[in-house]
């Protein structure tokens, strides 16, 4: 059974995650040029199913696209390079999900524009936090 | 970290076939398409095609349309490339690359040689 | 086929320079173009991506710039590492299709 300690590790570390995705999603969404209409373009898969923290294995897939999707936007919309974003994002997202057994991430059939990613995984990561609360 | 390795190098006959194949690894096999380059020696790169490894589906560029077909087996995450009717002048490394809509050939297999000689 | 018609085919250059390459469409591509580094023996390895975005990983010295048809990749300050075959590619329309190359050399 988890103990209390490891279940506050497991909120600071959802909590991180939802406020570096929230982050990304606002650098979005005050982002002015013509590339957004390109990011815009760009499908990202979505899970079937999020309901647990091995589903995380469905955002760990997307990232590198997600990388380089944010890459057409000027680093000024970031606090930090989409490169270390995604770098911090993939830390906290291997330690959640946990390397212990292998989850083979189903998808949905239908896509997502980064937007419509980002909040499925922002209200993925609220939803997990407030059963740990 | 995403891997692209290709199969070893073919001397072939005039008239015969060549069959390459690509390992993928460091990435979900099917989230993003096969494409297949060219290079004749001390040439550029020639773009042969592509191949979606989820549906199967593919599209090649006119000059080898006939001659190529791409397929795929999902389960060991490796693409191939057969050309047919081979001529000298399809004497090439062959590489292979992923895509993704617009995120194109962003990681390469080492590249294959095919040598067709009588 | 969109032909795309690169220039120079090859240039000499030392470290330090300021190297422009250019590739033209023979019709509008929008910002459907990447730039492709290939040293001898090794596969193309991306550089930029729609029009100027850097590969991770890539050296900020190499910037891409240009719409529509007329395409520039410069590489700000060359270094010995630099020495190479540039290539650019479209694709906006099947069949891809890659320019004839710009061979760089030490002057």
């Known amino acids: 059974a988890p103990t209390s300690s490891s279940t506050k590790k497991t909120q600071l570390q959802l909590e991180h995650l939802l406020l570096d995705l929230q982050m990304i999603l606002n650098g979005i969404n005050n982002y002015k040029n013509p590339k957004l209409t390109r990011m815009l373009t760009f499908k990202f898969y979505m899970p079937k199913k999020a309901t647990e923290l091995k589903h995380l294995q469905c955002l760990e897939e997307e990232l590198k696209p997600l990388e380089e999707v944010l890459n057409l936007a000027q680093s000024k919309n970031f606090h930090l390079r989409p490169r270390d974003l995604i770098s911090n994002i993939n830390v906290i997202v291997l330690e959640l999900k946990g390397s212990e057994t292998t989850f083979m991430c189903e998808y949905a059939d239908e896509t997502a524009t980064i937007v419509e990613f980002l909040n499925r995984w922002i209200t993925f990561c609220q939803s997990i936090i407030s059963t740990l609360t | 970290q995403v891997q692209l390795v290709q199969s070893g190098a073919e001397v072939k006959k005039p008239g015969a076939s060549v069959k390459v194949s690509c390992k993928a690894s460091?990435?979900?096999?099917?989230?993003?398409?096969i494409n297949w380059v060219r290079q004749a020696t001390g040439q550029g790169l020639e773009w042969m095609g592509w191949?979606?490894?989820?549906?199967?589906?593919?599209g090649y560029a006119q000059k080898f349309q006939g001659r190529v077909t791409m397929t795929r087996n999902t389960s060991i995450s490796t693409a191939y490339m057969e050309l047919s009717s081979l001529r000298s002048e399809d004497t090439a490394v062959y590489y292979c690359?992923?895509?993704?809509?617009?995120?194109?050939?962003?990681?390469w297999g080492q590249g294959t040689l095919v040598t067709v000689s009588s | 086929d969109i032909q795309m018609t690169q220039s120079p085919s090859s240039l000499s250059a030392s470290v330090g320079d300021r190297v422009t390459i250019t590739c033209r469409a023979s019709?509008?591509?929008?910002?459907?173009l990447g730039w492709y580094q290939q040293k001898p023996g090794k596969a193309p390895k991306r550089l930029i991506y729609?029009?100027?975005s850097l590969q991770s990983g890539v050296p900020s010295r190499f910037s891409g710039s240009g719409s529509g048809t007329e395409f520039t990749l410069t590489i700000s300050s060359l270094q010995p590492e630099d020495f190479a075959t540039y290539y650019c590619?479209?694709?906006?329309?099947?069949?891809?299709?890659f320019g004839q190359g710009t061979k760089v050399e030490i002057k």
């Open positions: 729609v029009v100027s």
């Open positions: 460091g990435y979900r096999f099917t989230s993003y398409d």
């Open positions: 191949m979606n490894p989820n549906s199967g589906n593919t």
């Open positions: 590619l479209q694709h906006n329309g099947y069949p891809w299709t």
């Open positions: 019709q509008d591509i929008r910002d459907d």
């Open positions: 690359a992923r895509s993704r809509q617009w995120l194109v050939l962003d990681y």
